[in-house]
Amino acid sequence: FPTSLSDCQTPTGWNCSGYDDRENDLFLCDTNTCKFDGECLRIGDTVTCVCQFKCNNDYVPVCGSNGESYQNECYLRQAACKQQSEILVVSEGSCATDAGSGSGDGVHEGSGETSQKETSTCDICQFGAECDEDAEDVWCVCNIDCSQTNFNPLCASDGKSYDNACQIKEASCQKQEKIEVMSLGRCQDNTTTTTKSEDGHYARTDYAENANKLEESAREHHIPCPEHYNGFCMHGKCEHSINMQEPSCRCDAGYTGQHCEKKDYSVLYVVPGPVRFQYV
Protein backbone atom coordinates (compact mmCIF):
# COMPACT_ATOMS: atom_id res chain seq x y z
CA PHE A 1 0.00 0.00 0.00
CA PRO A 2 1.52 3.34 -0.95
CA THR A 3 2.78 5.66 1.75
CA SER A 4 3.01 8.61 -0.59
CA LEU A 5 1.73 9.68 -3.95
CA SER A 6 5.23 9.51 -5.35
CA ASP A 7 5.00 5.74 -4.97
CA CYS A 8 2.25 5.80 -7.58
CA GLN A 9 4.31 7.81 -10.02
CA THR A 10 7.32 5.53 -10.34
CA PRO A 11 7.29 2.85 -13.02
CA THR A 12 8.38 0.28 -10.48
CA GLY A 13 6.22 1.68 -7.70
CA TRP A 14 3.04 0.53 -6.04
CA ASN A 15 -0.18 -0.24 -7.86
CA CYS A 16 -2.15 2.75 -6.73
CA SER A 17 -5.41 2.03 -8.52
CA GLY A 18 -7.30 2.12 -5.24
CA TYR A 19 -5.62 5.22 -3.95
CA ASP A 20 -8.44 7.59 -4.90
CA ASP A 21 -11.07 5.37 -3.34
CA ARG A 22 -10.16 6.10 0.23
CA GLU A 23 -12.98 8.59 0.63
CA ASN A 24 -12.81 8.55 4.40
CA ASP A 25 -9.08 8.84 4.59
CA LEU A 26 -7.84 11.86 6.49
CA PHE A 27 -4.59 13.08 5.05
CA LEU A 28 -2.24 15.44 6.78
CA CYS A 29 -0.32 16.99 3.95
CA ASP A 30 -0.56 20.10 1.88
CA THR A 31 2.02 22.00 -0.09
CA ASN A 32 2.93 24.04 2.97
CA THR A 33 3.32 21.18 5.43
CA CYS A 34 6.85 20.28 4.42
CA LYS A 35 8.94 23.13 3.17
CA PHE A 36 12.49 22.88 1.86
CA ASP A 37 11.91 19.94 -0.47
CA GLY A 38 10.63 17.55 2.18
CA GLU A 39 8.20 14.85 1.14
CA CYS A 40 5.15 14.76 3.38
CA LEU A 41 3.83 11.36 4.37
CA ARG A 42 0.93 10.53 6.65
CA ILE A 43 1.39 7.30 8.55
CA GLY A 44 -1.28 6.63 11.16
CA ASP A 45 -1.69 9.78 13.23
CA THR A 46 1.80 11.00 12.43
CA VAL A 47 2.78 13.45 9.76
CA THR A 48 6.28 12.75 8.55
CA CYS A 49 8.38 15.08 6.48
CA VAL A 50 10.86 12.81 4.76
CA CYS A 51 14.10 14.55 3.96
CA GLN A 52 16.15 11.82 2.37
CA PHE A 53 18.03 13.62 -0.35
CA LYS A 54 20.46 10.79 -1.21
CA CYS A 55 23.40 13.16 -0.95
CA ASN A 56 26.57 11.97 -2.62
CA ASN A 57 30.02 11.67 -1.11
CA ASP A 58 31.60 14.64 -2.89
CA TYR A 59 33.66 16.84 -0.61
CA VAL A 60 32.68 20.39 -1.54
CA PRO A 61 32.40 21.87 1.95
CA VAL A 62 30.08 24.79 2.57
CA CYS A 63 29.35 27.00 5.54
CA GLY A 64 25.69 27.44 6.41
CA SER A 65 23.97 30.57 7.69
CA ASN A 66 23.48 28.70 10.98
CA GLY A 67 27.24 28.61 11.42
CA GLU A 68 27.54 24.89 10.75
CA SER A 69 29.71 23.21 8.16
CA TYR A 70 28.46 20.62 5.69
CA GLN A 71 30.21 18.11 3.44
CA ASN A 72 28.43 19.63 0.44
CA GLU A 73 25.38 21.73 -0.32
CA CYS A 74 23.10 18.71 -0.44
CA TYR A 75 23.79 17.98 3.23
CA LEU A 76 22.95 21.59 4.02
CA ARG A 77 19.63 21.36 2.18
CA GLN A 78 18.92 18.08 3.90
CA ALA A 79 19.48 19.72 7.29
CA ALA A 80 17.23 22.64 6.32
CA CYS A 81 14.54 20.15 5.37
CA LYS A 82 14.92 18.18 8.60
CA GLN A 83 14.75 21.34 10.69
CA GLN A 84 12.11 22.90 8.42
CA SER A 85 14.02 26.14 8.54
CA GLU A 86 16.03 28.07 6.02
CA ILE A 87 19.78 27.52 5.92
CA LEU A 88 21.68 29.47 3.29
CA VAL A 89 25.19 28.89 2.01
CA VAL A 90 27.13 31.85 3.34
CA SER A 91 30.48 30.72 1.95
CA GLU A 92 32.26 27.91 0.24
CA GLY A 93 34.59 25.96 2.48
CA SER A 94 33.94 24.97 6.06
CA CYS A 95 32.93 27.61 8.57
CA ALA A 96 35.78 29.20 10.43
CA THR A 97 33.94 28.38 13.64
CA ASP A 98 30.84 26.24 13.85
CA ALA A 99 27.85 27.34 15.85
CA GLY A 100 27.79 23.76 17.07
CA SER A 101 25.21 21.08 16.54
CA GLY A 102 21.77 20.81 17.99
CA SER A 103 23.07 18.02 20.18
CA GLY A 104 25.32 20.40 22.00
CA ASP A 105 28.46 19.28 20.23
CA GLY A 106 31.27 21.74 19.76
CA VAL A 107 32.81 23.26 16.67
CA HIS A 108 33.56 21.93 13.25
CA GLU A 109 36.62 22.28 11.11
CA GLY A 110 37.57 25.63 9.69
CA SER A 111 38.81 26.66 6.30
CA GLY A 112 41.57 29.17 5.92
CA GLU A 113 39.61 30.72 3.08
CA THR A 114 36.48 31.70 4.94
CA SER A 115 36.10 34.33 7.59
CA GLN A 116 34.09 33.76 10.73
CA LYS A 117 30.41 34.42 10.29
CA GLU A 118 29.25 37.39 12.31
CA THR A 119 26.35 36.62 14.58
CA SER A 120 23.28 38.26 13.12
CA THR A 121 20.15 39.42 14.87
CA CYS A 122 18.40 37.62 12.04
CA ASP A 123 19.23 34.35 13.78
CA ILE A 124 16.15 34.87 15.95
CA CYS A 125 13.81 34.27 12.99
CA GLN A 126 12.32 30.81 13.23
CA PHE A 127 9.29 28.77 12.13
CA GLY A 128 9.72 29.48 8.44
CA ALA A 129 10.32 33.21 8.82
CA GLU A 130 12.83 34.94 6.59
CA CYS A 131 14.86 37.85 7.82
CA ASP A 132 14.62 41.30 6.30
CA GLU A 133 17.98 42.81 7.23
CA ASP A 134 17.13 46.07 5.48
CA ALA A 135 14.39 46.86 7.96
CA GLU A 136 15.26 49.38 10.67
CA ASP A 137 14.25 46.90 13.32
CA VAL A 138 14.72 43.15 13.12
CA TRP A 139 11.84 41.93 11.02
CA CYS A 140 10.95 38.32 10.57
CA VAL A 141 9.15 38.16 7.26
CA CYS A 142 6.64 35.39 6.70
CA ASN A 143 6.33 34.73 2.99
CA ILE A 144 3.71 32.02 3.39
CA ASP A 145 0.88 32.23 0.88
CA CYS A 146 -2.27 30.44 2.03
CA SER A 147 -4.53 31.88 -0.64
CA GLN A 148 -4.62 28.65 -2.63
CA THR A 149 -5.23 26.39 0.35
CA ASN A 150 -8.72 24.92 0.73
CA PHE A 151 -11.04 25.53 3.66
CA ASN A 152 -10.50 22.85 6.28
CA PRO A 153 -11.10 24.25 9.78
CA LEU A 154 -8.69 23.15 12.49
CA CYS A 155 -8.10 23.73 16.15
CA ALA A 156 -4.49 24.58 16.95
CA SER A 157 -2.33 24.20 20.04
CA ASP A 158 -2.73 27.91 20.81
CA GLY A 159 -6.45 27.29 21.39
CA LYS A 160 -7.46 29.17 18.26
CA SER A 161 -9.27 28.06 15.12
CA TYR A 162 -7.78 28.34 11.65
CA ASP A 163 -9.22 27.81 8.21
CA ASN A 164 -6.48 25.35 7.24
CA ALA A 165 -3.06 24.05 8.20
CA CYS A 166 -1.34 26.64 6.08
CA GLN A 167 -2.77 29.37 8.27
CA ILE A 168 -1.48 27.58 11.35
CA LYS A 169 1.97 27.49 9.81
CA GLU A 170 1.60 31.17 8.94
CA ALA A 171 0.51 32.04 12.47
CA SER A 172 3.41 30.08 13.90
CA CYS A 173 5.72 32.06 11.66
CA GLN A 174 4.12 35.39 12.45
CA LYS A 175 4.09 34.88 16.20
CA GLN A 176 7.47 33.15 16.15
CA GLU A 177 6.18 30.39 18.38
CA LYS A 178 5.40 26.72 17.95
CA ILE A 179 1.77 26.20 16.95
CA GLU A 180 0.57 22.76 15.92
CA VAL A 181 -2.64 21.12 14.76
CA MET A 182 -4.52 19.69 17.71
CA SER A 183 -7.83 18.53 16.30
CA LEU A 184 -10.18 18.55 13.36
CA GLY A 185 -12.74 21.36 13.22
CA ARG A 186 -12.91 24.64 15.05
CA CYS A 187 -11.96 24.95 18.69
CA GLN A 188 -14.80 25.20 21.20
CA ASP A 189 -13.91 28.79 22.06
CA ASN A 190 -11.53 31.06 20.18
CA THR A 191 -11.21 34.76 19.61
CA THR A 192 -8.04 35.43 17.72
CA THR A 193 -6.66 34.89 14.28
CA THR A 194 -3.64 36.29 12.50
CA THR A 195 -3.15 38.16 9.28
CA LYS A 196 -0.21 39.13 7.17
CA SER A 197 0.24 42.78 6.32
CA GLU A 198 0.78 43.82 2.70
CA ASP A 199 4.54 44.00 3.03
CA GLY A 200 4.68 40.48 4.41
CA HIS A 201 5.71 41.48 7.90
CA TYR A 202 3.67 39.86 10.57
CA ALA A 203 0.84 41.57 12.36
CA ARG A 204 -1.77 40.30 14.76
CA THR A 205 -5.44 41.20 14.63
CA ASP A 206 -7.91 40.49 17.40
CA TYR A 207 -11.47 40.30 16.17
CA ALA A 208 -14.46 41.31 18.27
CA GLU A 209 -16.42 38.26 17.17
CA ASN A 210 -14.94 34.83 17.33
CA ALA A 211 -14.21 32.90 14.17
CA ASN A 212 -17.40 30.86 14.39
CA LYS A 213 -19.50 34.02 14.21
CA LEU A 214 -17.39 35.35 11.38
CA GLU A 215 -17.99 32.20 9.44
CA GLU A 216 -21.72 32.34 10.12
CA SER A 217 -21.95 35.93 8.98
CA ALA A 218 -20.04 35.11 5.81
CA ARG A 219 -22.50 32.36 4.99
CA GLU A 220 -25.57 34.58 5.43
CA HIS A 221 -25.02 35.82 1.87
CA HIS A 222 -25.46 32.31 0.47
CA ILE A 223 -28.68 30.40 0.00
CA PRO A 224 -29.05 26.70 -0.82
CA CYS A 225 -29.23 25.89 -4.51
CA PRO A 226 -32.57 25.11 -6.15
CA GLU A 227 -33.39 21.42 -6.42
CA HIS A 228 -32.61 21.25 -10.13
CA TYR A 229 -28.99 21.83 -9.17
CA ASN A 230 -28.81 18.51 -7.33
CA GLY A 231 -25.54 16.85 -8.29
CA PHE A 232 -24.01 20.15 -9.38
CA CYS A 233 -21.35 19.69 -6.70
CA MET A 234 -19.95 16.16 -6.65
CA HIS A 235 -18.13 16.44 -3.30
CA GLY A 236 -19.38 19.56 -1.62
CA LYS A 237 -22.28 21.88 -0.91
CA CYS A 238 -24.00 23.88 -3.58
CA GLU A 239 -24.47 27.52 -2.64
CA HIS A 240 -26.25 30.30 -4.50
CA SER A 241 -25.27 33.88 -3.94
CA ILE A 242 -27.53 36.80 -4.67
CA ASN A 243 -24.52 38.41 -6.32
CA MET A 244 -23.82 35.51 -8.64
CA GLN A 245 -25.58 34.21 -11.73
CA GLU A 246 -24.20 30.69 -11.38
CA PRO A 247 -24.21 28.70 -8.14
CA SER A 248 -20.86 27.85 -6.61
CA CYS A 249 -19.55 24.83 -4.78
CA ARG A 250 -18.08 24.84 -1.32
CA CYS A 251 -15.92 21.74 -1.68
CA ASP A 252 -15.46 19.16 1.01
CA ALA A 253 -11.93 18.94 2.33
CA GLY A 254 -9.83 17.08 -0.16
CA TYR A 255 -11.72 18.06 -3.28
CA THR A 256 -11.29 20.88 -5.72
CA GLY A 257 -12.53 22.07 -9.09
CA GLN A 258 -15.62 24.01 -10.13
CA HIS A 259 -17.85 21.06 -9.24
CA CYS A 260 -15.62 19.60 -6.50
CA GLU A 261 -14.94 16.79 -8.90
CA LYS A 262 -11.18 16.53 -8.47
CA LYS A 263 -9.33 14.88 -5.62
CA ASP A 264 -7.03 17.53 -4.17
CA TYR A 265 -3.87 16.00 -2.83
CA SER A 266 -2.39 19.32 -1.86
CA VAL A 267 -5.01 20.04 0.75
CA LEU A 268 -4.49 19.17 4.36
CA TYR A 269 -6.90 16.69 5.86
CA VAL A 270 -6.53 16.18 9.55
CA VAL A 271 -6.72 13.10 11.69
CA PRO A 272 -9.02 13.89 14.61
CA GLY A 273 -7.25 14.17 17.92
CA PRO A 274 -3.67 15.21 18.65
CA VAL A 275 -1.39 15.06 15.66
CA ARG A 276 2.31 14.36 15.89
CA PHE A 277 4.67 16.00 13.41
CA GLN A 278 7.89 14.17 12.82
CA TYR A 279 10.89 14.92 10.61
CA VAL A 280 13.06 12.10 9.36
Epitope: F53, D58, V60, S69, Y75, K82, D105, G106, H108
Partner: antibody, heavy 112, light 110 residues
Framework: QIQLVQSGPELKKPGETVKISCKAS????????MSWVKQAPGKGLKWMGW????????TYADDFKGRFAFSLETSASTAYLQINNLKNEDTATYFC?????WGQGTLVTVSA | DIVLTQSPASLAVSLGQRATISCRAS??????????MHWYQQKPGQPPKLLIY???NLESGVPARFSGSGSGTDFTLNIHPVEEEDAATYYC????????FGGGTKLEIK
Protein backbone atom coordinates in the same frame (compact mmCIF):
# COMPACT_ATOMS: atom_id res chain seq x y z
CA GLN B 1 36.65 20.26 18.87
CA ILE B 2 35.96 17.52 16.39
CA GLN B 3 36.93 14.04 17.45
CA LEU B 4 36.48 10.60 15.97
CA VAL B 5 37.33 7.96 18.53
CA GLN B 6 37.65 4.37 17.42
CA SER B 7 37.48 1.20 19.48
CA GLY B 8 40.65 -0.58 20.54
CA PRO B 9 42.82 -3.17 18.79
CA GLU B 10 41.39 -6.60 18.04
CA LEU B 11 43.06 -9.99 17.79
CA LYS B 12 40.89 -12.48 15.96
CA LYS B 13 41.07 -15.93 14.44
CA PRO B 14 40.24 -16.66 10.81
CA GLY B 15 36.52 -17.16 10.31
CA GLU B 16 35.54 -14.95 13.25
CA THR B 17 33.72 -11.62 13.13
CA VAL B 18 34.93 -8.23 14.29
CA LYS B 19 32.95 -5.02 14.81
CA ILE B 20 34.80 -1.72 15.07
CA SER B 21 33.12 1.41 16.43
CA CYS B 22 33.77 5.04 15.57
CA LYS B 23 32.24 7.66 17.85
CA ALA B 24 32.00 11.19 16.51
CA SER B 25 31.76 14.36 18.57
CA UNK B 26 32.16 18.08 18.07
CA UNK B 27 29.94 18.37 15.02
CA UNK B 28 26.52 17.40 13.72
CA UNK B 29 26.90 13.75 12.81
CA UNK B 30 24.54 13.88 9.83
CA UNK B 31 26.34 16.81 8.17
CA UNK B 32 29.02 14.51 6.76
CA UNK B 33 29.17 11.03 5.31
CA MET B 34 31.38 8.49 7.06
CA SER B 35 34.09 6.74 5.08
CA TRP B 36 36.14 3.70 6.04
CA VAL B 37 39.74 3.21 4.91
CA LYS B 38 41.95 0.13 5.19
CA GLN B 39 45.72 0.24 5.53
CA ALA B 40 47.56 -3.06 5.57
CA PRO B 41 50.96 -3.05 7.33
CA GLY B 42 53.49 -1.13 5.24
CA LYS B 43 50.94 -0.50 2.49
CA GLY B 44 48.99 2.44 1.16
CA LEU B 45 45.49 3.67 1.92
CA LYS B 46 42.56 1.78 0.43
CA TRP B 47 39.11 3.35 0.42
CA MET B 48 36.52 0.77 1.48
CA GLY B 49 33.37 2.80 1.00
CA TRP B 50 31.12 5.10 2.94
CA UNK B 51 27.78 5.31 4.67
CA UNK B 52 25.32 8.17 4.37
CA UNK B 53 24.88 9.19 8.00
CA UNK B 54 21.43 10.58 7.30
CA UNK B 55 19.82 7.77 5.31
CA UNK B 56 22.00 4.94 6.60
CA UNK B 57 22.65 3.81 3.04
CA UNK B 58 26.06 2.17 2.64
CA THR B 59 28.20 2.15 -0.51
CA TYR B 60 31.02 -0.36 -0.83
CA ALA B 61 34.08 -0.32 -3.06
CA ASP B 62 34.27 -3.40 -5.26
CA ASP B 63 36.92 -5.13 -3.14
CA PHE B 64 34.80 -4.76 -0.02
CA LYS B 65 31.47 -6.16 -1.11
CA GLY B 66 30.19 -9.21 0.72
CA ARG B 67 31.94 -9.69 4.06
CA PHE B 68 31.98 -6.04 5.07
CA ALA B 69 29.10 -4.08 6.56
CA PHE B 70 28.79 -0.43 7.57
CA SER B 71 26.13 0.57 10.06
CA LEU B 72 25.12 3.47 12.29
CA GLU B 73 23.76 4.32 15.67
CA THR B 74 22.83 7.87 14.80
CA SER B 75 21.50 8.76 18.25
CA ALA B 76 24.95 7.99 19.63
CA SER B 77 26.79 9.62 16.69
CA THR B 78 28.53 6.31 16.13
CA ALA B 79 29.43 4.40 12.98
CA TYR B 80 30.40 0.75 12.83
CA LEU B 81 32.42 -1.47 10.54
CA GLN B 82 31.77 -5.19 10.78
CA ILE B 83 33.94 -7.74 9.01
CA ASN B 84 32.59 -11.27 8.82
CA ASN B 85 34.47 -14.51 8.17
CA LEU B 86 37.83 -12.88 8.83
CA LYS B 87 40.80 -13.80 6.66
CA ASN B 88 44.52 -13.28 7.22
CA GLU B 89 44.55 -10.56 4.57
CA ASP B 90 42.12 -8.53 6.68
CA THR B 91 44.98 -7.79 9.06
CA ALA B 92 45.23 -4.01 8.84
CA THR B 93 44.55 -0.71 10.51
CA TYR B 94 41.05 0.58 9.75
CA PHE B 95 40.31 4.30 9.81
CA CYS B 96 36.91 5.93 9.98
CA UNK B 97 36.23 9.51 8.99
CA UNK B 98 36.08 11.58 5.89
CA UNK B 99 38.10 14.28 4.31
CA UNK B 100 39.13 16.71 7.04
CA UNK B 101 38.84 14.44 10.09
CA TRP B 102 39.76 10.84 10.84
CA GLY B 103 39.76 8.47 13.75
CA GLN B 104 43.03 7.27 15.24
CA GLY B 105 42.67 3.88 13.58
CA THR B 106 41.89 0.38 14.86
CA LEU B 107 44.38 -2.40 14.31
CA VAL B 108 42.75 -5.72 13.52
CA THR B 109 45.08 -8.71 13.59
CA VAL B 110 43.85 -11.99 12.15
CA SER B 111 45.97 -14.94 13.12
CA ALA B 112 45.41 -18.61 13.79
CA ASP C 1 36.60 2.76 -10.87
CA ILE C 2 38.87 5.72 -11.50
CA VAL C 3 42.51 4.72 -11.06
CA LEU C 4 44.93 7.30 -9.66
CA THR C 5 48.60 6.94 -10.51
CA GLN C 6 51.05 8.89 -8.37
CA SER C 7 54.63 9.72 -9.31
CA PRO C 8 57.27 9.47 -8.18
CA ALA C 9 56.82 6.63 -5.67
CA SER C 10 59.46 8.33 -3.53
CA LEU C 11 61.60 11.41 -3.64
CA ALA C 12 64.28 13.08 -1.57
CA VAL C 13 64.34 16.86 -1.41
CA SER C 14 66.76 19.17 0.33
CA LEU C 15 65.52 21.41 3.11
CA GLY C 16 64.13 24.64 1.69
CA GLN C 17 63.75 23.26 -1.82
CA ARG C 18 60.58 22.45 -3.76
CA ALA C 19 58.88 19.05 -3.73
CA THR C 20 56.52 18.27 -6.59
CA ILE C 21 54.23 15.24 -6.60
CA SER C 22 52.02 14.33 -9.53
CA CYS C 23 48.74 12.44 -9.68
CA ARG C 24 47.11 11.26 -12.89
CA ALA C 25 43.52 10.01 -13.04
CA SER C 26 42.38 7.35 -15.53
CA UNK C 27 39.50 9.67 -16.41
CA UNK C 28 38.55 13.23 -15.65
CA UNK C 29 37.57 14.04 -12.08
CA UNK C 30 36.54 17.58 -13.01
CA UNK C 31 32.90 18.48 -13.52
CA UNK C 32 30.48 21.31 -12.77
CA UNK C 33 33.33 23.73 -12.20
CA UNK C 34 35.01 21.58 -9.56
CA UNK C 35 37.99 19.26 -9.66
CA UNK C 36 37.29 16.55 -7.12
CA MET C 37 40.90 15.85 -6.20
CA HIS C 38 42.28 16.01 -2.68
CA TRP C 39 45.73 15.60 -1.18
CA TYR C 40 46.58 13.95 2.14
CA GLN C 41 49.68 13.67 4.26
CA GLN C 42 50.27 10.61 6.44
CA LYS C 43 52.98 10.03 8.99
CA PRO C 44 53.74 6.60 10.48
CA GLY C 45 51.19 5.52 13.10
CA GLN C 46 48.86 8.40 12.32
CA PRO C 47 45.66 8.80 10.32
CA PRO C 48 45.78 10.73 7.05
CA LYS C 49 45.59 14.51 7.24
CA LEU C 50 43.80 16.57 4.60
CA LEU C 51 46.05 19.22 3.07
CA ILE C 52 44.32 20.33 -0.12
CA TYR C 53 40.72 19.80 -1.21
CA UNK C 54 39.11 20.35 -4.60
CA UNK C 55 42.52 20.46 -6.29
CA UNK C 56 43.68 23.82 -4.98
CA ASN C 57 41.92 24.77 -1.72
CA LEU C 58 44.12 24.85 1.36
CA GLU C 59 42.54 23.13 4.33
CA SER C 60 42.36 25.11 7.57
CA GLY C 61 45.53 25.02 9.62
CA VAL C 62 47.68 23.77 6.77
CA PRO C 63 50.80 25.90 6.09
CA ALA C 64 50.76 28.01 2.94
CA ARG C 65 53.85 26.26 1.64
CA PHE C 66 51.49 23.52 0.47
CA SER C 67 49.67 24.20 -2.78
CA GLY C 68 47.71 22.19 -5.29
CA SER C 69 46.88 22.68 -8.94
CA GLY C 70 45.48 20.89 -11.95
CA SER C 71 42.20 19.89 -13.54
CA GLY C 72 40.74 17.08 -15.56
CA THR C 73 43.15 14.18 -15.20
CA ASP C 74 46.44 15.79 -14.16
CA PHE C 75 47.07 17.21 -10.71
CA THR C 76 50.09 18.41 -8.78
CA LEU C 77 50.96 18.94 -5.13
CA ASN C 78 53.77 21.39 -4.46
CA ILE C 79 55.60 21.91 -1.17
CA HIS C 80 57.88 24.93 -1.05
CA PRO C 81 59.98 25.52 0.88
CA VAL C 82 60.18 21.98 2.23
CA GLU C 83 60.65 21.67 5.99
CA GLU C 84 61.79 18.70 8.05
CA GLU C 85 58.33 18.04 9.43
CA ASP C 86 57.10 17.47 5.88
CA ALA C 87 58.75 14.06 5.76
CA ALA C 88 55.74 11.78 5.23
CA THR C 89 53.81 9.83 2.63
CA TYR C 90 51.47 11.86 0.44
CA TYR C 91 48.34 10.51 -1.21
CA CYS C 92 46.00 11.94 -3.80
CA UNK C 93 42.35 10.93 -3.63
CA UNK C 94 39.35 11.71 -5.80
CA UNK C 95 35.77 12.02 -4.55
CA UNK C 96 33.86 11.36 -7.74
CA UNK C 97 31.82 8.16 -7.88
CA UNK C 98 33.55 5.55 -5.72
CA UNK C 99 36.60 7.17 -4.18
CA UNK C 100 40.10 5.83 -4.66
CA PHE C 101 43.53 6.78 -3.36
CA GLY C 102 46.70 7.01 -5.35
CA GLY C 103 49.54 4.65 -4.47
CA GLY C 104 51.33 7.22 -2.36
CA THR C 105 54.58 9.16 -2.60
CA LYS C 106 57.13 8.95 0.19
CA LEU C 107 58.91 12.25 0.76
CA GLU C 108 62.33 12.18 2.40
CA ILE C 109 64.12 15.34 3.50
CA LYS C 110 67.86 15.44 2.69
Amino acid sequence: QIQLVQSGPELKKPGETVKISCKASGYTFTNYGMSWVKQAPGKGLKWMGWINTYTGEPTYADDFKGRFAFSLETSASTAYLQINNLKNEDTATYFCGGDAYWGQGTLVTVSA
Amino acid sequence: DIVLTQSPASLAVSLGQRATISCRASKSVSTSGYSYMHWYQQKPGQPPKLLIYLASNLESGVPARFSGSGSGTDFTLNIHPVEEEDAATYYCQHSRELRTFGGGTKLEIK
